[in-house]
Amino acid sequence: MAVTACQGLGFVVSLIGIAGIIAATCMDQWSTQDLYNNPVTAVFNYQGLWRSCVRESSGFTECRGYFTLLGLPAMLQAVRALMIVGIVLGAIGLLVSIFALKCIRIGSMEDSAKANMTLTSGIMFIVSGLCAIAGVSVFANMLVTNFWMSTANMYTGMGGMVQTVQTRYTFGAALFVGWVAGGLTLIGGVMMCIACRGLAPEETNYKAVSYHASGHSVAYKPGGFKASTGFGSNTKNKKIYDGGARTEDEVQSYPSKHDYV
């Protein structure tokens, strides 16, 4: 029962985490214009992994995609790669874990197979979470480094030099979403790995024993029984786990140091 709950909870937590990683990857607010101790501007600049946006005081928002691939800095490419790898691994992990759930019956799949699948998905979730955390952390480090590189009329952003007034960027909402989502995916993966240990069947072979009942010459030979896990053909005390994860990801496209184009 505890194993089922752990596995189900791990799945739901990972599902939320991966949804969060996808949301963070798609969000435009990875870095946002630092408003503290800066001149009050009539525009608000913010940037994501795929495009940079400017929201004017009128509410008009204009976004420009980074249409170049070779012109983009290696660090940005690395962050993109880490987030995509995290999403792909997470998606595969989710697919595997669905079939590994104890509450879902697929043919005559043995518990050992389910245990292996649970472990596989757990490892995938852990790696996925680590990828997301690493990607977000690399970007955050990039922001911190660039934040202090400020001179009067020139900046060395992630995309080169432009003669312009210094615009400093700070952590955007996507970074926090990414960190939390990566953490949840990691926790979900650990829970799946823990559940795997409880799922793994222990092979216990009982040797044939002759029971001589008085007045009878009947020998009972039980043979090699597997330790019952409460599932298999025994449907007594079977509980279907219903994990309904609901995520509401609001991706806003509303406001340089990091003009990637």
Epitope: A42, V54, S58, G59, E62, T164, D259
Partner: antibody, heavy 120, light 113 residues
Framework: EVQLVESGGGLVQPGGSLRLSCAAS????????IHWVRQAPGKGLEWVAY????????YYADTVKGRFTISRDNAKNSLYLQMTSLRAEDTAVYYC?????????????WGQGTTVTVSS | DIVMTQSPDSLAVSLGERATISCKSS????????????LAWYQQKPGQPPKLLIY???TRASGVPDRFSGSGSGTDFTLTISSLQAEDVAVYYC?????????FGQGTKLEIK
């Protein structure tokens, strides 16, 4: 047709108060930020204040900060400028101007203006 | 505050000739986020409110004749009237649209020679 009509100007003594109004028509008022800009006699344009669509963002020129209050009533399609502690240097024609939506923050439509005279 | 300086203060040009007004800002009006310049030009005729001519340093507002053009980037901007017409007699103002408080140039009075 976009129209902005200012009213409420007049003669007021130094230290006195006045409330200017700007009635908007011909466009969805609640979709636009509005500015007050003034022009002293024979002088250039001076930006006074700005209020965003939903009144969440308000900015003032340093010369009027603490004395003037900009507000709006989207239900009435109206903009207001409450002026207190008026000084002689506040004498000017006051214009309300619409902040264009996709005009890089430029003011695309202006009212005809209302004259405020601060004199004893 | 951003200081906008226009030159000349007044300008007399013959009908059909080119008129050029310059505007300099104390800080760059180029927003690095979108590589756009936040500078506007206004025309004010006597007894009338200002009228938007150019925004974003070079984009003509709707209904503005194509003889009006804007150019420049960063801190240096220019308004050009390719062939001066009688109705172009007015005072022209440049304006910083990037930083609050929004600031105007002192104005350039354009007259016919």
């Amino acid at each position: 047709e976009v129209q902005l009509v200012e009213s409420g100007g007049g003669l007021v003594q130094p230290g006195g108060s006045l409330r200017l109004s700007c009635a908007a028509s011909g466009f969805t008022f609640s979709d636009y930020g509005i500015h007050w800009v003034r022009q002293a006699p024979g002088k250039g344009l001076e930006w006074v204040a700005y209020i965003s669509r939903g009144s969440s963002t308000i900015y003032y020129a340093d010369t009027v900060k603490g004395r003037f209050t900009i507000s709006r009533d989207n239900a009435k399609n109206s903009l207001y400028l409450q002026m207190t502690s008026l000084r002689a240097e506040d004498t000017a024609v006051y214009y309300c101007a619409r902040g264009g939506y996709d005009t890089r923050n430029a003011m695309d439509y202006w009212g005809q203006g209302t004259t405020v005279t601060v004199s004893s | 505050d951003i200081v906008m300086t226009q030159s000349p203060d007044s300008l007399a040009v013959s009908l059909g000739e080119r008129a050029t007004i310059s505007c300099k800002s104390s800080q760059s009006l180029l927003n690095s986020g979108n590589q756009k310049n936040y500078l506007a030009w206004y025309q004010q005729k006597p007894g009338q409110p200002p009228k938007l001519l150019i925004y974003g340093a070079s984009t003509r507002a709707s209904g503005v004749p194509d003889r009006f053009s804007g150019s420049g980037s960063g801190t240096d901007f220019t308004l050009t009237i390719s062939s001066l017409q009688a109705e172009d007699v007015a005072v022209y103002y440049c304006q910083n649209d990037l930083y609050y408080p929004l600031t105007f140039g002192q104005g350039t009075k354009l007259e016919i020679k």
